[in-house]
């Protein structure tokens, strides 16, 4: 899997999208997990609704939300009030039984707030030693979802 980089500004919201094949993953719940080390486990942060038909309902764990457009095949994760410690490697997953398929590997980078005049030196950025040769950057512009943007699945 290539790694997609999403950059957000500290204190703002970052929206991460993970596209997938809606037919292949039909009926499957999804999850957002944080990679603990390069070879370590992926620790679950938040997962979609227990009832797959209600996957469109936004589920929160702390400042992280997840919602799934099961018809269009897009999983959306929102990291609210982004903080330096949110930077790191994550995965979007499709769950089946006790197994999990990786939909997308995501590197979250936290940029200093340009309006914040404090020393930006305490912001953590992924080190040069981490190799993401295949990574491509998606600049995610922070904004609130407009009414009607939350997608819905079919129900029968």
């Amino acid at each position: 899997h290539n790694t997609t980089v999403f950059q957000g500004v500290a204190g703002q919201s970052l929206q991460v999208s993970c596209p997938y094949d809606s037919m292949k993953h039909w009926g499957r719940r999804k999850a957002w997990c944080r990679q603990l080390g390069e070879k370590g486990p992926c620790q679950r942060v938040v997962s979609t609704h227990n009832l797959w038909l209600l996957s469109f309902l936004r589920r929160w764990n702390g400042s992280t939300a997840i919602t799934d457009d099961t018809l269009g095949g897009t999983l959306t994760i929102t990291l609210r009030n982004l903080q330096p410690h949110d930077a790191g490697l994550y995965q979007c997953q499709s769950l089946h039984g006790s197994e999990a398929d990786t939909l997308r590997k995501v590197l979250v980078e936290v940029l200093a707030d340009p309006l914040d005049h404090r020393d930006a030196g305490d912001l953590w950025f992924p080190g040069e030693s981490e190799s993401f040769e295949d990574a491509h950057v998606e600049h995610s512009i922070s904004r609130s979802l407009l009414e009607g943007e939350i997608p819905f699945p079919p129900t029968s």
Epitope: L71, E147, P154, T155
Partner: antibody, heavy 118, light 107 residues
Amino acid sequence: QVQLVQSGAEVKKPGSSVKVSCKASGGTFSSYAISWVRQAPGQGLEWMGGIIPISGTANYAQKFQGRVTITADESTSTAYMELSSLRSEDTAVYYCARTQEYTLFDSWGQGTMVTVSS
Amino acid sequence: EIVLTQSPATLSLSPGERATLSCRASQSVSSYLAWFQQKPGQAPRLLIYDASNRATGIPARFSGSGSGTDFTLTISSLEPEDFAVYYCQQDYHWPITFGGGTKVEIK
């Protein structure tokens, strides 16, 4: 601001059908789930079923399966709940509710009183 | 189906007092529980979702807690407008179900 406006009160005979409407304004109608909940006089709330307008398909509580039909007309941003083979115990206030973000019941219509009496 | 049992059925309190309402599920609903307030002649209003998150515009005196089978809605200091019926609701399993309600009345 999301608003749900329901049709007026109905008086029906046992064995007949009733169709209650719920017109939505604010936001994109096709992107929201609409549910129907009823409340008999002095009683609690009972989920009947719901629809995702973009797909036009509905989910029903087993208790109402075969007797209730929930539909939506995107062109008029209106959802409908039709209940057939009415009996006196169907006398209740029928509410439509719409998801906005968090639950299936983020915002509610004002309710429609349906009285079943011979 | 999951049965939600609310207790007490009626709670008689005075303005300014603390109200503690209970909702017990017949089996685990994880954190998939919401609380609604309903006043006479009105539609219900969402107060709490996901067991502990306040809905937009809901005053801080309302708080929810619990997970699994036992949940609590707390109103820290009752205001005159808080006297109403409160319902819990789960959507962890089909069908979606509501509790029987707790009426909070003025003592």
